[in-house]
Interface confidence: medium
């Protein structure tokens, strides 16, 4: 998938735009809002009726190198008695994010944008049909 | 992708850190073949902590459209289909990376930006704080 060009109806390309070789784009990986943090203090992953665990995946050739993935703990959902209710299902909620992939080709390096699917947490749902046909 | 020569010491010297600015291919590699979007597309309706999706559009960003979840209720939906206020619907938030056009309006020059999005909602047991 290609990144769309800026629509001509919205903007004219400013003179200040840096020159870029054809088929590529310039990317500054100094992150805007780098210090923004999600509050993890509420530990909703343990208090949810569809609780989950976190695992960190690490890849030195990816930027950012650390990506956190959630994993639902159970198949069913936890009821008020703390027991697993198997008429309900814990399902993963997923979100796409961008990463930069570094590729080594001999003595050269290339960079590629990549979409990564991150499991963010889990929610409790009712199956559409409860039983096998 | 665009190939950039490595240090003269190649192959012995290895750059551990990413350079501040890189040239990347305009094509985005999409590796997520593992999920079926149709399956999860209606979780927002069938969850015990249902949510609405709000469109956030910004032509200076890629992706230009991001969907934000807003929990429909304070409580959670019980087995009878009623809202149970002993439980709480809370948003699940995630930091994601997007591309911001920099300088503004430039077609092929971007900077990574971290944004906080609410992806969906989950039902939690409240931490009870009694008023003294």
């Amino acid at each position: 998938r290609k990144i769309p060009k800026v629509g001509h109806t919205f903007f004219q390309k400013p003179e200040s735009c840096p020159p870029v070789p054809g088929g590529s784009m310039k990317l500054d990986i100094g992150i805007i809002n780098e210090n923004q943090r999600v509050s993890m203090s509420r530990n909703i992953e343990s208090r949810s009726t569809s609780p989950w665990n976190y695992t960190v995946t690490w890849d030195p050739n990816r930027y950012p190198s650390e990506v956190v993935q959630a994993q639902c703990r159970n198949l069913g959902c936890i009821n008020a008695q703390g027991k697993e209710d198997i008429s309900m299902n814990s399902v993963p909620i997923q979100q796409e994010t961008l990463v930069v992939r570094r590729k080594h080709q001999g003595c050269s390096v290339s960079f590629q944008l990549e979409k990564v699917l991150v499991t963010v947490g889990c929610t409790c749902v009712t199956p559409v049909i409860h039983h096998v046909q | 992708g665009i190939t950039i020569p490595r240090n003269p010491g190649c192959p012995n010297s290895e750059d551990k850190n990413f350079p501040r600015t890189v040239m990347v291919n305009l094509n985005i590699h999409n590796r997520n073949t593992n999920t079926n979007p149709k399956r999860s597309s209606d979780y927002y309706n069938r969850s015990t902590s249902p949510w609405n999706l709000h469109r956030n559009e910004d032509p200076e960003r890629y992706p230009s459209v991001i969907w934000e979840a807003k929990c429909r209720h304070l409580g959670c939906i019980n087995a009878d289909g009623n809202v149970d206020y002993h439980m709480n619907s809370v948003p699940i938030q995630q930091e994601i990376l997007v591309l911001r056009r920099e300088p503004p309006h430039c077609p092929n020059s971007f900077r990574l930006e971290k944004i906080l999005v609410s992806v969906g909602c989950t039902c939690v047991t409240p931490i009870v704080h009694h008023v003294a």
Partner: antibody, heavy 123, light 106 residues
């Protein structure tokens, strides 16, 4: 068509461990849960637990917590069930069985079964 | 855990007979499944949701019941019905099965 092919019979000594595999084909492995059921000689079927390859979610029967460990290798479309600290009462036929997808059907709906793997624990 | 008790544990009947197997749950359940396991074979889903016939199952099989008492009926016994029959509930965690009813031909 859906097929679940389990690994062959195993004979183990008490205290040892055994890992039974279940190779799935004919459907998208990630989209359905996989359950394990024990059938000891002359005994009723016993549900041991199930795992969701997509979310990583696992549910165990309390009777098998600490005894059985369920895992998957999604790249190989294979589910595994490992039994530890084997005792004579673990001698049984172990079945893998496909459950629902959590979307159209409940995770706990079992439809297709593997052919079974006999595990014999004997000194 | 919900305990499932089947009766009888074994029975012998003649071809063409009407056969009834009952399953009693230790507490109320919403749905019951029934499985058939032929000698040396894998269990096969026969009835789901108490009364619904699984795909490819002959219409001589039927299921009924509610609450704690459920029944599997074979309206006209055939030689190929020789098997052990299990009831199973999935109302409550964990899934539990009855001890089985072994059906033989006289």
């Amino acid at each position: 068509q859906v097929q679940l092919v389990q690994s062959g019979a195993e004979v183990k000594k008490p205290g040892a461990s055994v890992k039974v595999s279940c190779k799935a084909s004919g459907y998208t492995f990630n989209e359905y849960t996989m359950h394990w059921v024990k059938q000891a000689p002359g005994q009723r079927l016993e549900w041991m637990g199930g795992i969701n390859p997509n979310s990583g979610g696992v549910s165990y029967n309390q009777n098998f917590k600490g005894k059985a460990t369920l895992t998957v290798d999604t790249s190989a479309s294979t589910a595994y069930m490992e039994l530890s600290s084997l005792r004579s009462e673990d001698t049984a036929v172990y079945y893998c069985a496909r459950g629902g997808d959590g979307y159209y059907t409940n995770y706990f709906d079992i439809d297709y079964w593997g052919q079974g793997t006999t595990v014999t624990v004997s000194s | 855990d919900i305990q499932m008790t089947q009766s009888p544990s074994s029975l012998s009947a003649s071809v063409g007979d009407r056969v009834t197997i009952t399953c009693s749950a230790s507490s109320s359940v919403n749905y019951m499944h029934w499985y058939q396991q032929k000698p040396g074979k894998v269990p096969k889903l026969l009835i789901y949701d108490t009364s619904k016939l699984a795909s490819g199952v002959p219409s001589r099989f039927s299921g009924s019941g509610s609450g704690t008492d459920f029944t599997l009926t074979i309206s006209s016994l055939q030689p190929e019905d020789v098997a052990t029959y299990y009831c199973q509930q999935w109302n409550s965690h964990p899934l539990t099965f009855g001890q089985g009813t072994k059906l033989e031909i006289k």
